[in-house]
């Protein structure tokens, strides 16, 4: 029961974590204009992995994508790669872990197979979480490095854009979402790995008994095969779960001249 709970909780925690990683990757607020003390400008700049946005006090918000690939800093590309790898590994991990859940029975899948799948998904979640944490941390480090360089944008030269204003950028909401989500995915992965140990059926330790037949000396070891081989039907301690798969069912804005948003 504890194993099932650990596995289920690990799956749920990882699911939330991966959803968070996806959300963080898509968010525009990776870096936001530093508003410490007073706003220097009447526009608010913020940037994501894929586009930069400007919000005026009029309420008008405009976002522009980074349409160049080669012109982007290597660090930004690395962060993108880490986040995408994290999402892909997490998604595969989720897929694998769904079939590994003890409460879902698929054909005649043995516990050992489920244990292996649980371990695989756990490792995937751990790597996914680490990728997200690493990606967010690399970006945060970029921000810290560039924070005091108030006369230069961290994407200077990107797509021919030159920063001409003294704008400093600080941590955006996406960084905190990414760190938390990465941590949750990591914790979920660890829980899956712990659950794997409880899922793996232990080898039945019967003492070897020798049967002496006339003219032959053959030693038989009952229960000598592990359940993972698929031989034998050691159903004595095997629990059959009759449970089907359970499914549980979230730019640019314009103010009107006559309607200030």
């Amino acid at each position: 029961m504890a194993v099932t709970a650990c596995q289920g909780l690990g799956f749920v925690v990882s699911l939330i974590g991966i959803a968070g990683i996806i959300a963080a990757t898509c968010m525009d607020q990776w870096s936001t204009q530093d508003l410490y003390n007073n706003p220097v400008t009447a526009v608010f700049n913020y940037q994501g992995l894929w586009r930069s946005c400007v919000r005026e006090s009029s309420g008008f918000t405009e976002c522009r994508g980074y349409f160049t690939l080669l012109g982007l800093p290597a660090m930004l590309q690395a962060v993108r790669a880490l986040m995408i790898v994290g999402i892909v590994l997490g998604a595969i991990g989720l897929l694998v872990s769904i079939f590994a859940l003890k409460c879902i029975r698929i054909g005649s899948m043995e516990d050992s197979a489920k244990a292996n799948m649980t371990l695989t998904s756990g490792i995937m979640f751990i790597v996914s979480g680490l990728c997200a944490i690493a990606g967010v941390s690399v970006f945060a480090n970029m921000l810290v490095t560039n924070f005091w360089m108030s006369t230069a944008n961290m994407y200077t030269g990107m797509g021919g854009m030159v920063q001409t204003v003294q704008t400093r950028y600080t941590f955006g909401a996406a960084l905190f979402v990414g760190w938390v989500a990465g941590g949750l995915t990591l914790i979920g992965g660890v829980m899956m790995c712990i659950a794997c140990r409880g899922l793996a059926p232990e080898e039945t330790n019967y003492k070897a008994v020798s049967y002496h037949a006339s003219g032959h000396s053959v030693a038989y070891k009952p229960g000598g095969f592990k359940a993972s081989t698929g031989f034998g039907s050691n159903t004595k301690n095997k629990k059959i779960y009759d449970g089907g798969a359970r499914t549980e069912d979230e730019v640019q804005s314009y103010p009107s001249k006559h309607d200030y948003v």
């Epitope: 706003p39 009447a42 526009v43 400007v54 405009e62 204003v165 103010p255 200030y260």
Partner: antibody
């Protein structure tokens, strides 16, 4: 039709305070309203802004110690109070509604404040 | 504070003439994030509040005649009236809409000869 209607002209003595109102009609009263003044024969001078939604305000450092901007959401009215009046505060005071590019698309008709002993 | 310098202070032109008004800011008004210049032009007639003509340095406000056009980037901006009409007699103000405090130029007075 969008309108910003300001209160009438005021005559004040030096050291006194004046409170000018600006009532908005014809649009949703949710974004920054700015105050600009113009001394006779002079240019325009930005005093500050107030967000009617949350009453947050930003003031020109020159007026920070003397100006207070408030709002009354129930009547869609913003107020600008200037204290410790001096003769050089004699000017026409305008309220203005913000638009694209942080420009001022809609202006009140102006309120003449005369500071004289 | 950002200093906005307008030139000339005043000018008198003939009807139908092309006129160029200049505005220079002490710092660049270009925002790198959206590549827009936060400079606005207003027209003010005697006894009236200013009227919005151009925002983002070159975007004409709806209802403004197309003889008015704005150009420039960074620190240097111009307002051009391709063919001056009698109703264009006014004071023209440029405004920094980017840095706090938002500042205005001293104005250029346009008159008809």
């Amino acid at each position: 039709q969008v309108q910003l209607v300001q209160s009438g002209a005021e005559v004040k003595k030096p050291g006194a305070s004046v409170k000018v109102s600006c009532k908005a009609s014809g649009y949703t009263f949710t974004n920054w309203v700015h105050w600009v003044r113009q001394a006779p024969g002079q240019g325009l001078e930005w005093m500050g802004e107030i967000n009617p939604t949350n009453a947050r305000s930003n003031y020109n450092e020159k007026f920070k110690k003397r100006v207070t901007m408030t709002r009354d959401r129930s009547t869609s009215t913003v107020y600008m109070e200037l204290s410790s009046l001096r003769s050089e505060d004699t000017a026409v005071y305008f309220c203005a509604g913000i638009y694209y590019g942080n420009s001022f698309a809609h202006w009140g008709q102006g309120t003449l404040v005369t500071v004289s002993s | 504070d950002i200093v906005m310098t307008q030139s000339p202070d005043s000018l008198a032109v003939s009807l139908g003439e092309r006129v160029t008004l200049n505005c220079k800011s002490s710092q660049s008004l270009l925002n790198a994030g959206n590549q827009k210049n936060y400079l606005t032009w207003y027209q003010q007639k005697p006894g009236q509040p200013p009227k919005l003509l151009i925002y983002w340095s070159s975007t004409r406000e709806s209802g403004v005649p197309d003889r008015f056009s704005g150009s420039g980037s960074g620190t240097d901006f111009t307002l051009t009236i391709s063919s001056v009409q009698a109703e264009d007699v006014a004071v023209y103000h440029c405004q920094n809409n980017y840095y706090y405090p938002l500042t205005f130029g001293g104005g250029t007075k346009l008159e008809i000869k």
